[in-house]
């Protein structure tokens, strides 16, 4: 499956939108920094077969979409930017789902690398727990926004590596 160029552009647009969503100066939130233990190895495309890499990307975008679709998220961010961001993520999910279906028939190996999917889910659980512990404070959301920008950047890099493999 060749991910369309629009998918890559969508990822970039999502990153730009997330960058614009900040409401307070990050400089005031240094004390709220937190180690979410991003599972970097899951974004190393070299160790995966293509179907597994796509499933990791799908899980990453799905979890990001879920995180920013909550009521608490709606209260934290400017509505029109949040809606545009969610739309970009939704489009990426559609692209990835089409690829997942296509890749199932191509590779005989199991579709999902369960350990990798679990690692991504646990990562987002840590993010959600952090927000709960910090009572969804503006700085907590700012830290999470920065973290998601980083994980989306990793996703973008994984997509680039996947395209190079084609």
């Amino acid at each position: 499956c060749d991910l369309p160029q629009t998918h890559s552009l969508g990822n970039r647009r999502a990153l730009i939108l997330l960058g614009q969503m900040g409401r307070i100066s990050p400089f005031s939130c240094l004390k709220d920094r937190h180690d979410f233990r991003i599972p970097q190895e899951e974004f190393d495309g070299n160790q995966f077969q293509k179907a597994q890499a796509i499933s990791v990307l799908h899980e990453m975008i799905q979890q990001t979409f879920n995180l920013f679709s909550t009521e608490d998220s709606s209260a934290a961010w400017e509505q029109s930017l949040l809606e545009k961001f969610s739309t970009e993520l939704y489009q990426q999910l559609n692209d990835l789902e089409a690829c997942v279906i296509q890749e199932v028939g191509v590779e005989e190996t199991p579709l999902m690398n369960e350990d990798s999917i679990l690692a991504v889910r646990k990562y987002f659980q840590r993010i959600t727990l952090y927000l709960i512990e910090r009572k969804y404070s503006p700085c907590a959301w700012e830290v999470v926004r920065a973290e998601i920008m980083r994980s989306l950047s990793f996703s973008t890099n994984l997509q680039k590596r996947l395209r190079r493999k084609d």
């Epitope: 990050p26 400089f27 240094l30 004390k31 920094r33 700012e142 830290v143 920065a146 973290e147 980083r150």
Partner: antibody
């Protein structure tokens, strides 16, 4: 390879203006903040200020507020430190360094090689 | 501003010695503390971040500990290349501030 490359040494007279630069490469320039640090001859490190190149939001140490201006041009991945009127006491080595912002990653993990500024009449 | 105080300001030691440098913050900084090494004419080099995390590429003889207000940098077995000046720096709030430095000299 991540690099911060600073502009060359400067010799200036008191009252003159100066702008020194720090060019980042090998990483996403807007994903990291750039901090500036002064080291006067034979002395320790003094933190001057920091800029977020993504939106040019800047903060200064009270000791340097109003004395210097920090800026950035993200289109060319470069941060700047400037003086409108130099004093002899500005003679020092100036370093830039990158900071991961709110991400959990090593602080000031890469530094420029330093720019020596000498102010003398 | 948060004040950072290092001790001692200088020390003499021999190759193979265990060296300990302490850093005290004027208020709690949790674990937001970094340690740097600087050699004459060179830029500082990050050794330890977040009080105890070893920066990539730094030898394991360097270690950091502490939280709150009191922190320690330990060099388990001093090597010839370790003679330098060491600085602590708080990273919890702006303005970031450095300790005054500890110069490690050859005995």
């Amino acid at each position: 390879e991540v690099q911060l490359v600073q502009s060359g040494a400067e010799v200036k007279k008191p009252g003159e203006s100066l702008k020194i630069s720090c060019k980042g490469s090998g990483y996403s320039f807007t994903s990291y903040w750039i901090g500036w640090v002064r080291q006067m001859p034979g002395k320790g490190l003094e933190w001057m200020g920091i800029i977020d190149p993504s939106d040019s939001d800047t903060r200064y140490s009270p000791s340097f507020q109003g004395q210097v201006t920090i800026s950035a041009d993200k289109s060319i991945s470069t941060a700047y430190l400037q003086w409108s009127s130099l004093k002899a006491s500005d003679t020092a080595m100036y370093y830039c360094a990158r900071h991961p912002g709110l991400n959990w990653a090593p602080d000031f993990d890469y530094w420029g090689q330093g720019t020596l500024v000498t102010v003398s009449s | 501003d948060i004040q950072m105080t290092q001790s001692p300001s200088s020390l003499s030691a021999s190759v193979g010695d265990r060296v300990t440098i302490t850093c005290r913050a004027s208020q709690s900084i949790n674990r937001f503390l970094n340690w740097y090494q600087q050699k004459p004419g060179k830029a500082p080099k990050l050794l330890i971040y977040a009080a105890s995390s070893l920066q990539s590429g730094v030898p394991s003889r360097f270690s950091g500990s502490g939280s709150g207000t009191d922190f320690t940098l330990t060099i388990s077995s001093l090597q010839p290349e370790d003679f330098a000046t060491y600085y602590c720096q708080q990273a919890i709030d702006l303005p970031f501030t450095f300790g005054q430095g500890t110069k490690v000299e050859i005995k």
